[in-house]
Each structure stands twice: as structure tokens, then as C-alpha cells.
């Protein structure tokens, strides 16, 4: 459950959005699960995936919406501080993590055009950074009504409170375990060689281990690929180059929290492969 003990908001604003696309959008994450989305076109914070069914207090999503509208205003205000130059992309990573002792550790950092350049300093209660752009934005934000106090409140109180609430009310979502469906296939490679690909589909949580055995002995982990699916689950694959004709000596072993024990995946017969 360690990987679930964080609540992070990924905020993005663009100074020159394409027609019909948002200038500001946010994804909210509980550990590896996206639970929230917001964009400036809709202007409403909305739950994602299974979090639609979380038994939250009636005003919860209104409060998320209010906070993110404030963030939207600040982020778009930042571009005014930077003047007419650009185009710019401003990103923020805001949130908190619960440590082993249940204390909250806040995170607040910002990137301009992909480079980290500014943070929010909790001790000093202000935004910091030494790029000229950081000074321009931080001074602009300081002038906004109670913006720094709101940021402090958000990081030190709202975030840990929400995280603890989700850990209580959404425990089922956080403890969700979906075992992978597996395939091991072979395809011809360079002359005299084949590529074995071990694929894992639709699993959760994302931690998963794939390795190959040859005649029961370790043959390595191969070259891997990993990514998210649109439904919140994940997929992964690993490929290993072997001598042609030797394929049937290999199998793939998968370990995952959704499996009671490691699963042995045998090579599919050519007829079954599509």
C-alpha cells in the first residue's frame, strides 16, 4: 500500500492553446491511480474511473472545483507576468505524501517549458526561484489576494485531509488487484534468430516482474516496455532474442500482486497465434 500514500495534482497551462483546446488542465492522482480531471473549458473537477463510485461528502467535488479554479486563475495570470514573449507551457506538481509516521510531506514545484524553475517555500510562505521568470511570476502571485496563504492551506491542510479521506472512503479502489492476462509469442528476427515476446495485459497495481527461463534456468529479463491503459490498468511486455528452433526451450515467469504465486507462461503454438 506504500505507493498509494500520495495525492498529487499535475497542473498544466499553455499560453497559446489551439482553438477548441483548454488553456489549463489538471489530473489528480492517488498513488498510481488518476482520480480527478479538470480543464478550463468545462471548469468542473470530475472524478475518474472507479472514483466516480467513491462515497464522498456532498460538497467534495465543489471544493476541488473551487481550488482548481483559483489555480487556473493563477497559472493564466503567470503568462501576463511574462509579457508577450513565448509560447510558454507552465506546469505544476502540487500535493502531499503521507510518511510512515502518518505525517504529511508537501510537494510544490513548477516547470517552465519543461524545466523546473520555481518552488513554493513553506517556511517563508512564498514562491522561490532565481530565474527572472520565477521572480516575475512569484511577484505577480504574491499580489493576488491571499494567494500565498491559500497555497499554504492547500498544501498543509486540504491535501493531507483529502488524502486521508480517500484512504478511508476509497479503500476498495486503492486495494484493487487485477491479475494480468498473459501471452508468450515467437516471431522470426534476423536470419537464424527469433524474438520471444512475453506480454501482460490489463493488470493493476502497476508493479509487475517478467523474466525468462530456458529449460528451467534464468535466461534474463529481456528488453521491456510498460504503459498505462485508458481504464486505469497497465500493460507490459518483454522481448528476448533466441536462436531459431530453440524457442520451445523457453518460458516466461510473471510475478504480480494479483497472482497468488508466480505464473509460468508457455509459448503459444503457431496455430493459436494471430
Amino acid at each position: 500500500a506504500e505507493s498509494h500514500l500520495s495525492l498529487l495534482y499535475h497542473l498544466t497551462a499553455v499560453s497559446s492553446p489551439a482553438p477548441g483546446t483548454p488553456a489549463f488542465w489538471v489530473s489528480g492522482w492517488l498513488g498510481p491511480q488518476q482520480y480527478l480531471s479538470y480543464n478550463s473549458l468545462r471548469g468542473e473537477a470530475e472524478p475518474c474511473g472507479a472514483w466516480v463510485w467513491e462515497n464522498q461528502v456532498s460538497w467534495y467535488w465543489e471544493k476541488e472545483t473551487t481550488d482548481l479554479r483559483i489555480k487556473e486563475k493563477l497559472f493564466l495570470e503567470a503568462f501576463k507576468a511574462l509579457g508577450g514573449k513565448g509560447p510558454y507551457t507552465l506546469q505544476g506538481l502540487l500535493g502531499c505524501e503521507l510518511g510512515p509516521d502518518n505525517t504529511s510531506v508537501p510537494t510544490a514545484k513548477f516547470a517552465l517549458n519543461g524545466e523546473e524553475f520555481m518552488n513554493f517555500d513553506l517556511k517563508q510562505g512564498t514562491w522561490g526561484g532565481d530565474w527572472p521568470e520565477a521572480l516575475a511570476i512569484s511577484q505577480r502571485w504574491q499580489q493576488q489576494d491571499k494567494a500565498a496563504n491559500k497555497e499554504l492551506t492547500f498544501l498543509l491542510f486540504s491535501c493531507p485531509h483529502r488524502l486521508r479521506e480517500h484512504l478511508e472512503r476509497g479503500r476498495g479502489n486503492l486495494e484493487w488487484k487485477e491479475p494480468p492476462s498473459m501471452r508468450l509469442k515467437a516471431r522470426p528476427s534476423s536470419p537464424g534468430f527469433s524474438v520471444l515476446t512475453c506480454s501482460a495485459f490489463s493488470f493493476y497495481p502497476p508493479e509487475l516482474q517478467l523474466r525468462f527461463l530456458r529449460n528451467g534456468l534464468a535466461a534474463g529479463t529481456g528488453q521491456g516496455d510498460f504503459g498505462p491503459n485508458s481504464d486505469g490498468s497497465f500493460h507490459a511486455s518483454s522481448s528476448l532474442t533466441v536462436k531459431s528452433g530453440d524457442e520451445h526451450h523457453y518460458c516466461c515467469i510473471v510475478q504480480h500482486a494479483g497472482l497468488a504465486q508466480p505464473l509460468r507462461v508457455e509459448l503459444e503454438s503457431p496455430a493459436k497465434s494471430s
Partner: antibody, heavy 119, light 106 residues
Amino acid sequence: EVQLQQSGVELARPGASVKMSCKASGYTFSSYAMQWVKKRPGQGLEWIGYINPGTGYTNYNQKFKDKATLTADKSSSTAYMHLSSLTSEDSAVYFCARGGGLRGAMDYWGQGTSVTVSS
Amino acid sequence: DIVLTQSPALMSASPGEKVTMTCSANSSVNYMYWYQQKPGSSPKLWIYSTSNLASGVPARFSGSGSGTSYSLTISSMEAEDAATYYCHQRSSYPWTFGGGTKLEIK
């Protein structure tokens, strides 16, 4: 023309403190960070920290956290550095520099303030 | 702290000669900055963001590198280039400088 004018030579006894100044002109003082750098004879440069004059935000090299205090006065466009509990290790030339270049690079430097600590 | 090691510490070059000095970091940095300092003067920003020449820096200077290895090159040494050059990283706090390379003219 951007200029950073630093205060003159400081002679001090061990245990004493000094406060040096860096007066900025030729640009909007609060729009750029003021960095401070230490240079001891025969040694390299050491970054002490910076202040954002507009907000008062400071960021220190932990090594200098208990040694240096950075402040700024917007009305006079002047940055200050106070050094406390001086020892011979603090004998050096101290530079202020504007963080005005791309990604905050130090693009203009003061002429330096020489501090000598001796009993 | 990221330690920047400059080499050589001292070098001399004849007019017209190509000069290369290096700066090695014990941990990866995004960009390197170089400052030139002459005796009795303040440092001057010379190269920023690894390869960009500061205003007024002659085109015979260039900077390159990535990760943990960076260099400053002078295509053709001139007398006015004699100085100490410091590399500087701003990727990780505390910002640090190298010990400097002192370049002399033969």
C-alpha cells in the same frame, strides 16, 4: 547601463560581524535575483545564496546558513549581506551578482568587497 | 553536493593555438555555465546553458557537453584570452563552481 556598486574594504576582529552592501542601478531591482559569491585567495568561487528583492525570498547554500543573512531594500535598490561570528576562514572577497541571464545565470557582477579578519 | 573538477588546473597556449579545457561533474547536470576572471577583476559570464556565448564574447569561444562531461574550447588562442575560467552548475542545490583552469599565454 547595469551596474552593481559594492561597499569598501572591511577589517574585522574574530567574533565580530560585518554588513556589506551592493547598490544596483540601470535595471528594475526587484525583477532579478541578487546572488552572492565568495572568493578566497588561491581558491575557487563558492555560492552563498540569493535573495529575490521583490518578495524577500532567500535561498542559502546550507554551508552559509548560519553565517550569512541576505536582505534587500527596494526603495534604495540595495542588497545587503551580513556575516556573523567572523573567523579567519571568512577572509575573502565577496561578490554580488545579478541573476539576470537565461535560467538565472549571473550576468552582471559587482567589483567585490574584501573582508579581512585578523586579531 | 555536486563536485565540479576542472582540468587542467593550469595550462599555457601559444597565440593561434587551439585550446580545450574540461569540467567533469560527479553527478549529471542539465547545463554548464562558464565564467572568465582576470586578476583584480570580477568574474564575467562567458558561456551560459552549455553552449551559448554571453554578450561580447568572441566567436572563437565555444562550449559543449552533456551529463557529467563539459568543455570550453578556444579555436585560436589570443593574448586577451589569458585568464582563469570557472565552470558552474545550477542543476542541483547548492549551486557549485569548479576550482578553475588558469590559462596563460606562451
